[in-house]
Structures are given as C-alpha cells and as structure tokens.
C-alpha cells in the first residue's frame, strides 16, 4: 500500500550530465544541454517526483511524472519504458505497482541516486544508447558499480 | 442489462462515520475502474473518488482527502466508500458509477447507480 | 483545478425547438497530442441518477436520440436539443476528465415554454 506525500520538482542528469526530457513522441530521452537550454525546454525538462509512504519500508517510494499539457506518469509496465496519461494517484493498494520507484542513494555517493522498480526487483532505470539517442529504460542490474543506473537529482522547487 | 445499487446510507452526527456499498452486476466488474459521485439537496454534481480497474490506483477530491476511503472487492463485485469525520457539508446522494475507462485514470460515468441519501446533522 | 461555468443557469424552450447550452472551462481540455476534448455531457431528470449522454465532447452514448448534439472545442463548449421534447425536460451538466479532480458545471435547467 502506497500513500501520496509530498512532491517536488527536479531536473534529473545521467552521469553524463546529460538531461532527461520527454520529447514531442512522449519519450523520455536524454540529452546534452546548457543550463539555459535547460531551461529553454521546460517543462519538458522538469520531473515532478511524488513521494509515497510504503506499508512495506523498501527505500523511498516515488513516481515520476511531467506536466506538457497534461501530467502523464512514468510505468514500467511489461518492464517497457512509458509515460503514462495519469496524475499521481493519492493511493495505490497494492505492494507493488508500475509506477512507483524506489529512490535510493548509491552506497558511497549520497548525491547519486539509483531508481529500482517496485514491480520487478533487480530492475533500475537506465539510460542506455539505441542508435543516436539515449533512452530512459528498465535494465536488470548485472553488475556493481553500473554507472548507467547512477543519476542526479536537482530540485528546482 | 448493467445495475448498480447502493446501500448504507442514513442520518449521522457530525465526527461520525458511515460505510457505503455498492452492488454491481451485468457486466465483469473487475474489469471497470468504479467513481463515487455526490449531489447535495437540490445542488449540482461533485466527483468524490476513483479506485482503477486494475493496479490498486486511487483518487480522491480535496474535499474528502484523508476522511473518506475508498475500496473495491471483485469477488463480491462491490465498490464501498468509508466516511470518517463526516461533517454538515457531507451531506448528499452518493452515487455509485462505472467510469468508461479501464485503465489507470478517471474519465466519463457510463452508468450510475440510483443513489443512497447521507444526512449529517446534530 | 478546472473550473467549468455553463450558461444560462435556466432556459424555457417551445416545444420543436432548438435549446442550447454553453459550457466553459477554465482551462483548455483539448489534449493536442490527440486531438480529443476531455467533455463529456450528462442530463439528469428529477429524482433520477444522471445519465450520460455526450462524450469526448461530441461522441453521441449508445441509444441517446440524435436531437442532442456536442460541439465545441479548448475551453468553449455547446450541447444542443434541435428540436425540444417533453421528455428532455431536465437538468444537464457538463463534465471535464482532462485532469483530477474531476469537475462539473453547476448545471442548466432546461424547461417547456
């Protein structure tokens, strides 16, 4: 059982510092990009990261959302990436769910933040290249210290 | 034929609670996200609450956020809506309706049940 | 929130008439990315449960008669009765689903002259 907390509004950075933004195909992409372009792109640009109460501690619960006319949610559904047409739900009565995150720090680097998914355990945000872009996926941790699961969280509140 | 009936309803006091239920049959209930809707006496229409088809994803309107819990039981095809800390303004017919859409959010009522009174007052 | 004003709050309409009726929100509920208007119409006779009849601002609901029509698009709405029957006689309400809560018009009394 999930319980909706606060939210804040963040800018969220690969290891290579490039932005995560979600595109006009509702993809959510990774590129590199100027504080000012940063700027220039929101709110394609800007997260909203709401945070939940587990009735199951497992690090801090999360969802992911944008709002480019209407607020759409991040889901791993199918462990396939995608932007869900949904605000933040106040609940979600289930231990696990598509849509929430676990946000954890990595051991050793309090500002790099690692987001495993409640509904497939092992599993973490990644960003990963396909061609020329780099995609927001769901990849199985296969070994320690994988900096392709490592971001950065910039509160913009 | 698609029915929805709503039991529970009553006079209670301010700070008192109130269980509604709702008995759904004609159509696979576990497959449609399910609204709570009320009217006041003789006022328009107010959006209550939404609990998903699947996915466990709940919503609530400001008015009743942290007093009203909303729940479903597919096996007895049921939706209910637990009132807490009920007050005057409560006061409605609380509708019980099938929301359109079967996936994760809230869109239009395609039936509605006939409604079940709560009168809240000393 | 969206703040949905409809107008007029009553109408009288003869019998074989046309009866409109307006519905603003106050926001647009036009989605570009598909082009659909989150607007949905219902009408509710008295001592009755609504019923909808509109949805996506101009999808007429199975078995509602084809005298009532939706029209309008982004924030400025209209349900409109071509030709008034006893039987329409009620109060309709219009509903945004663009974003929670969900919100309604405060409704417009339709009524025989």
């Known amino acids: 059982y999930f319980g909706k907390l606060e939210s804040k509004l963040s800018v969220i950075r690969n290891l290579n510092d490039q932005v995560l933004f979600i595109d006009q195909g509702n993809r959510p992409l990774f590129e590199d990009m100027t504080d000012s372009d940063c700027r220039d792109n929101a709110p394609r640009t800007i997260f909203i990261i709401s945070m939940y109460k587990d009735s199951q501690p497992r690090g801090m619960a999360v969802t992911i959302s944008v709002k480019c006319e209407k607020i759409s949610t991040l889901s791993c559904e199918n462990k396939i990436i995608s932007f869900k047409e949904m605000n933040p739900p106040d609940n979600i009565k289930d231990t696990k769910s598509d849509i929430i995150f676990f946000q954890r720090s990595v051991p050793g680097h309090d500002n790099k933040m690692q987001f495993e998914s409640s509904s497939y355990e092992g599993y973490f945000l990644a960003c990963e290249k396909e061609r020329d872009l780099f995609k927001l996926i769901l990849k199985k941790e296969d070994e320690l210290g994988d900096r392709s699961i490592m971001f950065t969280v910039q509160n913009e509140d | 034929e698609v029915q929805l009936v709503e039991s529970g309803g009553g006079s209670v006091q301010p700070r008192g609670s109130l269980r509604l239920s709702c008995a759904a049959s004609?159509?696979?209930?576990?497959?449609?996200?399910m609204n709570w809707v009320r009217q006041a006496p003789g006022k328009g229409l107010e959006w209550v609450s939404y609990f998903s088809s699947s996915g466990g994803i709940i919503y609530y309107a400001d008015s009743v956020k942290g007093r009203f819990t909303i729940s479903r039981d597919n096996a007895k095809n049921s939706l209910y809506l637990q009132m807490n800390s009920l007050r005057d303004e409560d006061t409605a017919v609380y509708y019980c309706?099938?929301?359109?859409?079967?996936?994760?959010?809230?869109?239009?009522?395609?039936?509605w049940g006939q409604g079940t009174l709560v009168t809240v007052s000393s | 929130d969206i703040v949905m004003t409809q107008s007029p709050d009553s109408l009288a309409v003869s019998l074989g008439e046309r009866a409109t009726i307006n519905c603003k929100s106050s926001?647009?509920?036009?989605?570009?990315?598909?082009?659909?208007?989150?607007l949905a119409w219902y009408q509710q006779k008295s001592g009755q449960p609504p019923k909808l009849l509109i949805y996506?601002?101009?999808t007429r609901e199975s078995g509602v008669p084809d005298r009532f029509s939706g029209s309008g698009s982004g924030t400025d709405f209209t349900l409109t009765i071509s030709s008034l029957q006893a039987e329409d006689v009620a109060v309709y309400y219009c509903q945004q689903y663009y974003s929670t809560p969900l919100t309604f018009g405060g409704g417009t009394k339709v009524e025989i002259k």
């Open positions: 926001q647009t509920v036009l989605y570009r990315s598909n082009n659909k208007n989150y």
């Open positions: 004609g159509f696979t209930f576990s497959s449609y996200s």
């Open positions: 309706a099938r929301d359109d859409s079967s996936g994760y959010y809230p869109y239009f009522f395609d039936y």
């Open positions: 996506w601002a101009s």
